[in-house]
Amino acid sequence: KNLKSPQKVEVDIIDDNFILRWNRSDESVGNVTFSFDYQKTGMDNWIKLSGCQNITSTKCNFSSLKLNVYEEIKLRIRAEKENTSSWYEVDSFTPFRKAQIGPPEVHLEAEDKAIVIHISPGTKDSVMWALDGLSFTYSLVIWKNSSGVEERIENIYSRHKIYKLSPETTYCLKVKAALLTSWKIGVYSPVHCIKTTVENELPPPENIEVSVQNQNYVLKWDYTYANMTFQVQWLHAFLKRNPGNHLYKWKQIPDCENVKTTQCVFPQNVFQKGIYLLRVQASDGNNTSFWSEEIKFDTEIQAFLLPPVFNIRSLSDSFHIYIGAPKQSGNTPVIQDYPLIYEIIFWENTSNAERKIIEKKTDVTVPNLKPLTVYCVKARAHTMDEKLNKSSVFSDAVCEKTKPGNTSK
């Protein structure tokens, strides 16, 4: 009896695992084995596919074959007993295009009101994703074990911290990877659960803010208790994206080590241009808090968002205000790469009633002023980008007297 060729061959590629599945064409024939050949683009000859020769089941693994994952490949299969079936050719495919991203590896770390999620690619040193390792982003679904109400978090990297959780509560989550550059969405990891710890005696510092004063950064935070010492650490933000590396070398800011106030001042030259994460921890000498929420700190925006410098030209019924770039040390203007909006506040020197003007232009007219009256003006800059949403501090107030009447020209 002639053997029929196997049918419905499926190629499943997950990360670096290459699996073939097929249907027996004739279930009634026993002791049949199956063998595959492969052919690379531009080749005429067929080569035996190692790992997929004389297979008795309907599944085989050819992961050991070192293929160029960006090169098209063709497969063929036949059944064998005493004689052989004709070859059945599988549609050619490019492994990279066909590949799915496997479930990532997940390790969880619990605090009292936070969970740190450490995510690594499921296949270490993957050949399939060798050129894309740094492009992985992850998304997760998290829920309280008791309620099951799911929250989705998109676009996270290999380390992600979720805050504002409840102590002594079990949370469960699953994570999947994505390669947005290749339009690939991976499969979810198994569900991982972890219980947050009992509430810590000392809460972490809150409401961390960075501002610029003179040539210094001023870091401020809030804390519940008095008589504490604090330390501040920084990390390059891009290190959170490093796949598989979960050693985060947080660095101390020397001027912010063991400070006894809820602020610290350090020179701008501590940081080179870049984006950093900052965190603060409190200690009472015996106990330490967990670290605060990490804030993102962009030196370009911070340095650039110094209060604006302005000149006033006084008329009888108005001021003309000319806004210039803020000055650094050495009186050099700061280069502004971001579109700004200016908030100008003015008031009569003898009154507390403030008026406000918001203006995109750098020359602004303040109208409806009284002649021979002293008015004071202060200004600050805001970024127009919603995502950055930064504001400078107000400039020092400048006070000027309007001219006598009829000097509008």
């Epitope: 770390e109 710890t197 810590n200 590396n245 050693l247 070398k249």
Partner: antibody, heavy 118, light 107 residues
């Protein structure tokens, strides 16, 4: 294969100094921390301090600040522990360890025995 | 500094038994605890990180658990090669501290 190879045993006189080395293979030390741990005979493990070979930053337990100096040379993939003003209290085995993911010490050297005796 | 207390200096067990080594932190360290095994005359070997995750190559009879201040290393189906001293360590604070160790004796 990750390994930490430590220098050989030392017999030194009280008041002298000693320099111990620890060479990493199978990994780049600048991507990790290198820690040093002291263990006296029949006693527990005591952390001395660590170095970040990438920039030379060090952290020490206060009691070892005047005793130990930890350095690293990335070109030879080697970390060092210098112990000064040695006394009999410094007689111990000293381990170098790799500070890996999640700050745990995932690999340990074979240990260097230091004996302080006149 | 955070003190890690291993109250039992010695524990006696038999091959095939289940034994639990405990460790208590002087303050909440989350789940940032590691466990090490040191056999006589050898250097320590890492077993567990983040309180409950096994390093690759560590037999699955070793299980870590706990969070906050109380941590446990459980060895189920104890083997003769598990005769060793076990140390816990907190990695939550950059000043790392070890427990004093628990010696496991096989009857």
């Amino acid at each position: 294969d990750v390994q930490l190879q430590q220098s050989g045993a030392e017999l030194v006189k009280p008041g002298a100094s000693v320099n111990l080395s620890c060479t990493g293979s199978g990994f780049n030390i600048k991507d990790y921390y290198i820690h040093w741990v002291k263990q006296r005979t029949e006693q527990g493990l005591e952390w001395i301090g660590r170095v970040d070979p990438e920039d030379g930053e060090t952290k020490y337990v206060p009691k070892f600040l005047d005793k130990a100096t930890i350095t690293a040379d990335t070109s030879s993939n080697t970390a060092y522990l210098q112990l000064s003003s040695l006394t009999s209290e410094d007689t111990a085995v000293y381990y170098c360890t790799r500070g890996g993911n999640y700050y745990a010490m995932d690999y340990w050297g074979q240990g260097t025995s230091v004996t302080v005796s006149s | 500094d955070i003190v890690m207390t291993q109250s039992q200096k010695f524990m006696s067990t038999s091959v095939g038994d289940r034994v639990s080594v405990t460790c208590k932190a002087s303050q909440n360290v989350g789940t940032n605890v590691a466990w090490y095994q040191q056999k006589s005359g050898q250097s320590p070997k890492a077993l567990i990180f983040l309180a409950s995750y096994r390093y690759s190559g560590v037999p699955d009879r070793f299980t870590g658990s706990g969070s906050g201040t109380d941590f446990t290393l459980t060895i189920s189906n104890v083997q003769s090669e598990d005769l060793a001293e076990y140390f816990c360590q907190q990695c939550n604070n950059y000043r790392l501290t070890f427990g004093s160790g628990t010696k496991l004796e096989i009857k």
